[in-house]
């Protein structure tokens, strides 16, 4: 079947990095500069993505793969393939439409992105607060009050785990 298809369609022989040039009797021509084809048998090459402004080049375009962008310092990627760059805030802040805003009391954000979230209410999960929350850190929940025997020595809690961070996929 593959052989038959190749006889019928000469374009199927054109590898990635080339295109099937109708103007030249369906000869496989290399992709022109600043373009690529990531699969074989293509009749055109795609224009390379350009990483400009707040975007910076993470991976250069080649004849077989598109360029990849990330964001300049102070910004982070959003969307599939880093389609946008969004301003970083400090820990203890959230990005609103009016810019970075401090977390209100009772909320925290330990990332440079995302929202201020309410501290975990340990009692709802039958636990007690081991370490109080701050603008930058959630509370640390420990055993339920009933599990702590009177006079038990205080336990030094582990450092709070890093909140989920979303690195560009």
């Amino acid at each position: 079947f593959e052989r038959t298809r190749s006889l019928q369609d000469p374009c199927s022989n054109c590898p990635a990095g080339t295109f099937c040039d109708n103007n030249r009797n369906q000869i496989c021509s290399p992709c022109p500069p600043n373009s690529f084809s990531s699969a074989g048998g293509q009749r055109t090459c795609d224009i390379c993505r350009q990483c400009k402004g707040v975007f910076r080049t993470r991976k250069e375009c080649s004849s077989t793969s598109n360029a990849e962008c990330d964001c300049t310092p102070g910004f982070h990627c959003l969307g599939a393939g880093c389609s946008m760059c969004e301003q970083d805030c400090k820990q203890g802040q959230e990005l609103t439409k009016k810019g970075c805003k401090d977390c209100c009391f009772g909320t925290f954000n330990d990332q440079k992105r995302g929202i201020c979230r309410p501290w975990t209410n340990c009692s709802l999960d039958g636990k007690s607060v081991l370490v109080n929350g701050t603008k930058e850190r959630d509370v640390v929940c420990g055993p339920s009050p009933a599990d702590l025997s009177p006079g038990a020595s205080s336990v030094t809690p582990p450092a709070p785990a890093r909140e989920p961070g979303h690195s560009p996929q």
Epitope: L95, K97, C104, R113, T120, C141, A161, E163
Partner: antibody, heavy 120, light 106 residues
């Protein structure tokens, strides 16, 4: 391929508890908050709460506080939602949903849903 | 608590433009996300952060948000767009959904 696969349908009696699981694949469970949303027959979407799979920190909608517990097992890449003291009004499809990256908290991937029927 | 109001239903002829609104107090200051849900299926994110489209969502879907109203616009409506649509915001300590709008393609 990013996927959230939930456990199968459940039939429960009033007063009982139900525990629904949500297994993540194609990404690291610890990387994103996980939410639970339910939908009663013919009704809209209702948010129940989230878990930070990294630390185990939770936040529950006021309506469900005291009845819902969201947990996770990172080694199994699975989040769980347990609802207790079930009543007929809890009959619904329960969804897990991954929090996305947008400003203001979006839910970018959803499980297929688990139908929980509460009937005597 | 914060409330989002959507019309229960919107009807539109194929090829025309559908507009679904989502009302909320000063909603323009919040980020609005929109979900499409077809019968028997899980919701799908179609617009996030007011107007951005996830990969795989057609350009026919667009969003806007200002004042007290956010709007999901579907241009050149197709039969396959028939579904329920929900708006959603984050409000200080909870995720809030609108009541949903059933889009009927005539």
């Amino acid at each position: 391929q990013m996927q959230l696969v939930q456990s199968g349908a459940e039939v429960k009696k009033p007063g009982a508890s139900v525990k629904v699981s949500c297994k993540a694949s194609g990404y690291s469970l610890e990387g994103y908050y996980m939410h639970w949303v339910r939908q009663a027959p013919g009704q809209g979407l209702e948010w129940m709460g989230w878990i930070n799979p990294n630390s185990g920190g939770t936040n529950y909608a006021q309506k469900f506080q005291g009845r819902v517990t969201i947990t996770r097992d990172t080694s199994a890449s699975t989040a769980y939602m347990e609802l207790s003291s079930l009543r007929s009004e809890d009959t619904a499809v329960y969804y897990c949903a991954r929090e996305g990256e947008a400003v203001g908290l979006d839910l970018d991937y959803w499980g297929q849903g688990t139908l929980v029927t509460v009937s005597s | 608590s914060y409330e989002l109001t959507q019309p229960p239903s919107v009807s539109v002829a194929p090829g025309k433009t559908a507009r679904i609104t989502c009302g909320g107090n000063n909603i323009g200051s919040k980020s609005v996300h929109w979900y499409q849900q077809k019968p028997g299926q899980a919701p799908v994110l179609v617009i996030y952060y007011d107007s951005d489209r996830p990969s795989g969502i057609p350009e026919r879907f667009s969003g806007s948000n200002s004042g007290n109203t956010a709007t999901l616009t579907i241009s050149r409506v197709e039969a396959g767009d028939e579904a329920d649509y929900y708006c959603q915001v984050w409000d200080s300590s909870s995720v809030v959904f609108g009541g949903g709008t059933q889009l009927t393609v005539l």
